[in-house]
Interface confidence: medium
Amino acid sequence: AGVFELQIHSFGPGPGPGAPRSPCSARLPCRLFFRVCLKPGLSEEAAESPCALGAALSARGPVYTEQPGAPAPDLPLPDGLLQVPFRDAWPGTFSFIIETWREELGDQIGGPAWSLLARVAGRRRLAAGGPWARDIQRAGAWELRFSYRARCEPPAVGTACTRLCRPRSAPSRCGPGLRPCAPLEDECEAPLVCRAGCSPEHGFCEQPGECRCLEGWTGPLCTVPVSTSSCLSPRGPSSATTGCLVPGPGPCDGNPCANGGSCSETPRSFECTCPRGFYGLRCEVSGVTCADGPCFNGGLCVGGADPDSAYICHCPPGFQGSNCEKRVDRCSLQPCRNGGLCLDLGHALRCRCRAGFAGPRCEHDLDDCAGRACANGGTCVEGGGAHRCSCALGFGGRDCRERADPCAARPCAHGGRCYAHFSGLVCACAPGYMGARCEFPVHPDGASALPAAPPGLRPGDPQRYL
């Protein structure tokens, strides 16, 4: 087991004429993110298969707004590595696809939209545990610079992450025939279980006594290189080191086929066999098809039998966009009326209505007072989606059914005693106080704090609260 790591260094216009404009419109700011897809082996079939070794998506890069008229600079990139964990042996040879995606960030309904900006592909040999390998790939007028490596996750080591390391049993050295596990010098190689003599560089095993070869090697111990077309070429002098014939200059030298295309000579020139998703004389044109899995979120892809025919994504409920990349925000159009709360449940839209409103979209204004009687002579008042009773004197509660206790709030001041009365309350004041609520002291000279007592009442008499 281990991890393939990809570091994007830059994405911008390639050299030469026809530099692209910024990928962000003057209208819409955007930001970039990357997707990597890994497949084992170098064969043509590998380019069309799913991402059998794994895939990863980067974080979103910083927001970029185009300065109108300016050429595209190197665009701001997401932080960090793209990491693709692999569970089994690292195959040594692999195919990759790196996609640059743009996320548009206007105020568009439905939120940000994604679109594929560029796509590069290639096939490489890579030993696990080695240094970072640097690469440059072009897609149309764009250029992507990146580095990659494969590293083993402990306890696995070796070029295929198939040898295992274990902590030392003795503090000083490893057991007989077992080497220290560089770079983990405090650990030792676990006893080899592969077939005796199985090449540690080009072979691996998953079962004891087995010897399985990495791509490009053959033989019972994986020590024999597989013949390649360059070794069989009739041109050029023989190479002393490999026994292969080194080809002289030819139309395929330097591989004119972009994006991982393979070159074959024709009588007059060369021909590129392009991986799925690319076409053109030099495989320089990207044309995404259903085989590339362009539909997100479980969308069904239809069409795209040949590279330059369009594909259509049929999106599952709750998603939209040409790649089903956008979650439908059905609440953004504010379908719930009268202040209702919108809930997007994915399979359906639900409105939670405020009191006094009903209907699927809270469109019905309920007659708050309809069928609601206020008891004991109270009158119904509509308002704010809820009914309220204005109660007659001596009654209270939601429907005026409760007889009010006017003395409950202790309205009589200065120790006055409260008596409930059919029309309200009466305060019997303590000596020295007067007033409807016994609020006024009676002065010692007999004059009250009031200018005059109401007719028919003497100071000190119970005062009826009118």
Epitope: P20, R21, P23, S25, A26, R27, L28, P68, G69, E104, G106, D107, Q108, I109, A113, S115, S322, S332, L333, Q334
Partner: antibody, heavy 117, light 107 residues
Framework: EVKLEESGGGLVQPGESMKLSCAAS????????MDWVRQSPEKGLEWVAE??????????YYAESVKGKFTISRDDSKSRVYLQMNNLRAADTGIYYC????????WGQGTLVTVST | DIQMTQTTSSLSASLGDRVTISCRAS??????LNWYQQKPDGTVKLLIY???RLHSGVPSRFSGSGSGTDYSLTISNLEPEDIATYYC?????????FGGGTKLEIK
């Protein structure tokens, strides 16, 4: 339902001013970028001006032909966008539409502006 | 400014036909292209944005495609209510410019 309703059009003399208004409803106006687009038989559809939302500092942009002459503004509290047009010329005659969102998702019915003696 | 050209100014088709309207930009507009429908009463509606994305509420018989400088709008099964003038518009670069329109009529 999204609604955009333009008003303020009519007949003016060359050199005069006019202010168009667009009342919006049915969507979160403060989130939306708003534009004015005009249409005339001579020039067809022609983008005039753009005002972005608060998140984009209410940035404004204009077509070269109206720069310095027209001013776009908005009042988020009233869900309205305006186009103040000064020093009008016969070439400014046309139907003026207001549109909502950065992908020009919704358009009003338009208001006719005629500049003539 | 980017020029948008709709070479066909008017088009006659029968109900049920598949109709394609094309639009060409004077430079690469990197898919920032909208299609609008204008009815005889002046009502304008967005049909397709960003080359191929169907605006909400637009029937699925409308579709858009293209890249670089060449774009097209297709109506797969022409219906009576599709009688209108169709405009393309680029919003890749200011000023956002429109095509001259293609008027679609019934044979």
């Amino acid at each position: 339902e999204v609604k955009l309703e333009e008003s303020g059009g009519g007949l003016v003399q060359p050199g005069e001013s006019m202010k168009l208004s667009c009342a919006a409803s049915g969507f979160t106006f403060s989130d939306a970028w708003m534009d004015w687009v005009r249409q005339s038989p001579e020039k067809g559809l022609e983008w005039v001006a753009e005002i972005r939302n608060k998140a984009n500092n209410h940035a404004t942009y204009y077509a070269e032909s109206v720069k310095g002459k027209f001013t776009i503004s908005r009042d988020d509290s009233k869900s309205r966008v305006y186009l103040q047009m000064n020093n009008l010329r016969a070439a400014d005659t046309g139907i003026y539409y207001c549109t909502a969102y950065s992908n020009f998702a919704y358009w009003g019915q338009g208001t006719l502006v005629t500049v003539s003696t | 400014d980017i020029q948008m050209t709709q070479t066909t100014s008017s088009l006659s088709a029968s109900l049920g036909d598949r109709v394609t309207i094309s639009c060409r930009a004077s430079q690469n507009i990197i898919n920032y292209l909208n299609w609008y429908q204008q009815k005889p009463d002046g009502t304008v509606k967005l049909l397709i944005y960003y080359t191929s994305r169907l605006h909400s509420g637009v029937p699925s018989r409308f579709s858009g495609s293209g890249s670089g400088t060449d774009y097209s709008l297709t109506i797969s099964n022409l219906e009576p209510e599709d009688i209108a003038t169709y405009y393309c518009q680029q919003y890749s670069e200011r000023p956002y410019t429109f095509g001259g329109g293609t008027k679609l009529e019934i044979k």
